[in-house]
Interface confidence: low
């Protein structure tokens, strides 16, 4: 068992030419989330087949709306990680399908409408418990930046999550040949000899003696790619001449679970509900007691002095399951008042608070204001947590130092030509149109669209704008 | 890909003083949050400090007034300070950095580059 981990980087316009329009609005405010489908293997499967590895949906991005006539940058992420918890062995080879989705927030009738932006596929080779990859898709216009992992859940440990950590036996090293399970460095892989010359990469073993191929290998020591042109079934154990998946039994065909234990199918393989005082992944493993060390992490074990007896696992903070072997998710309280980010530092939880916001957990709302000084003149407004100044005319900029050219957004209408003053601008307007910014006709007879011209200001004089 | 080089670990007496550096180099297309972490023998890997792109600094309780994380963005360098080093900080020490998604956040934890480590000793 483990969990494959999606985090999205950044979703936003690919490079080169055509960059796509963004897609909120000021009239049309929207947020993004994603969905990642995942199928075993390297098939290349419809959109629409299941996602047999299992799918994950994100939470929604912060709320975004678009500046007119600016081009899309890249669009606000949800917080967090995609999830995909998978049962069994991971299959080491797996196709991925990532969409992009936008929840439009205008006032549509019957809520939020949903829409597809744009959806990635790619087929990957991927061992668990190794470092993040990293990946582009781009889909049209759009550029997608992620990264992945498939990482064990304990006891399961390896490249496909099949082999098993057990506690110590001894306090100081594990047995002969067997390594610690990193990074359980307390706890030691349990000894499991595959068949010899089992490939390592495409192989694995639940029984010693055994070798198992992972999803697209074949042959008695798993060395061979399945070939899929010529095979007709899905199901069953390889070929290893032909190279070819043919019919064969079913995994809890002839029970493997041992002790009593009862078999129920899953997707690719099989699961053992064992009974009491035996576990395992075919329930083999017999009479757990506190003696043999059932709690992970540190647990303390409670009763369970003969086999017959049930124990229970007392867990320390931040560790759940009955054996201790789950870490609580303390972010998942939401512990950060006001917007504030949770981490989970492990030995401590933090909160990473909004601008203007303070405390150990966002709890104080700071003086925007205070402390800020806004340069030449301007004003300090507070609001939303974050200062802003108003600057005084003619500069600009988060705290008013750089000067501003009143030009830039050419004010003057009608063709009147801009001249920047200290106190300013100056439109000099074209003949036939006055005012502040040149916005009036002179009518043919004289008569302006104004009221009246200012005294000793004739129409076409250059008006200052203050 | 990005690589990272730790260097500046040694041996070193209690209270004394060391500086470590972390040269960054490789696609740099994001601005980063960096960490030091730690792992010392038979413990588990742990936080020692960390700075957001924006500058912003956090320190486990353990290191604080001792230690000071800074960083240099002409360089692409990350720097650890270590003051009145005391003989639990023997330990391997990681530099870390993590390009996590938007708004220049640390998300502790979900590091997608580390170092190889180098080594602080801190014994008599």
């Known amino acids: 068992a483990g969990v494959f981990e999606l985090q999205i980087h950044s979703f936003g316009p690919g490079p080169g030419p055509g960059a796509p329009r963004s897609p909120c609005s000021a009239r049309l405010p929207c947020r993004l989330f994603f969905r990642v489908c995942l199928k075993p293997g390297l098939s290349e499967e419809a959109a629409e087949s299941p996602c047999a590895l299992g799918a994950a949906l994100s939470a929604r991005g912060p709320v975004y709306t678009e500046q007119p006539g600016a081009p899309a940058p890249d669009l606000p992420l949800p917080d967090g990680l995609l999830q995909v918890p998978f049962r069994d062995a991971w299959p080491g080879t797996f196709s991925f399908i990532i969409e992009t989705w936008r929840e439009e927030l205008g006032d549509q009738i019957g809520g939020p409408a949903w829409s597809l932006l744009a959806r990635v596929a790619g087929r990957r080779r991927l061992a668990a418990g190794g470092p993040w990859a990293r990946d582009i898709q781009r889909a049209g216009a759009w550029e997608l930046r992620f990264s992945y992992r498939a990482r064990c859940e304990p006891p399961a440990v390896g490249t496909a999550c099949t082999r098993l950590c057990r506690p110590r036996s001894a306090p100081s090293r594990c047995g002969p040949g067997l390594r610690p399970c990193a990074p359980l460095e307390d706890e030691c892989e349990a000894p499991l000899v595959c068949r010899a010359g089992c490939s390592p990469e495409h192989g694995f073993c639940e029984q010693p003696g055994e070798c198992r191929c992972l999803e697209g290998w074949t042959g008695p020591l798993c060395t061979v790619p399945v070939s899929t042109s010529s095979c007709l079934s899905p199901r069953g154990p390889s070929s290893a001449t032909t190279g070819c998946l043919v019919p064969g039994p079913g995994p809890c065909d002839g029970n493997p679970c041992a002790n009593g234990g009862s078999c129920s199918e899953t997707p690719r393989s099989f699961e053992c509900t064992c009974p009491r005082g035996f576990y395992g992944l075919r329930c083999e493993v017999s009479g757990v007691t506190c003696a043999d060390g059932p709690c992970f992490n540190g647990g303390l074990c409670v009763g369970g002095a003969d086999p017959d007896s049930a124990y229970i696992c007392h867990c320390p903070p931040g560790f759940q399951g009955s054996n201790c072997e789950k870490r609580v998710d303390r972010c998942s309280l939401q512990p950060c008042r006001n917007g504030g980010l949770c981490l989970d530092l492990g030995h401590a939880l933090r909160c990473r608070c909004r601008a203007g916001f303070a405390g150990p957990r966002c709890e104080h709302d700071l003086d925007d204001c205070a402390g800020r000084a806004c340069a030449n003149g301007g004003t300090c407004v507070e609001g939303g947590g974050a200062h802003r100044c108003s600057c005084a005319l003619g500069f600009g900029g988060r705290d008013c130092r750089e000067r501003a050219d009143p030009c830039a957004a050419r004010p003057c209408a009608h063709g009147g030509r801009c001249y920047a003053h200290f106190s300013g601008l100056v439109c000099a307007c074209a003949p036939g149109y006055m005012g502040a910014r040149c916005e009036f006709p002179v009518h043919p007879d004289g008569a302006s669209a104004l009221p009246a011209a200012p005294p000793g200001l004739r129409p076409g004089d250059p008006q200052r704008y203050l | 890909e990005v690589q990272l080089v730790e260097s500046g670990g040694g041996l070193v007496q209690p209270g004394g003083s060391l500086r470590l550096s972390c040269a960054a180099s490789?696609?740099?297309?994001?601005?980063?949050?960096m960490g030091w972490f730690r792992q010392a023998p038979g413990k588990e890997r742990e936080g020692v400090a960390d700075?957001?792109?924006?500058?912003?600094?956090s320190y486990a309780d353990s290191v604080k007034g001792r230690f000071t994380i800074s960083r240099d963005n002409s360089k692409n360098t990350l720097y650890l300070q270590m003051n009145s080093l005391r003989a639990e900080d023997t330990a391997v020490y990681y530099c870390?950095?993590?390009?996590?998604?938007?708004?220049?956040?640390?998300?502790?934890?979900?590091?997608?580059?580390w170092g190889q480590g180098t080594l602080v000793t801190v014994s008599s």
């Open positions: 870390a950095v993590d390009r996590g998604g938007s708004g220049g956040y640390c998300y502790t934890g979900r590091y997608d580059y």
């Open positions: 490789g696609d740099t297309y994001r601005s980063y949050c």
């Open positions: 700075i957001v792109s924006d500058g912003s600094t």
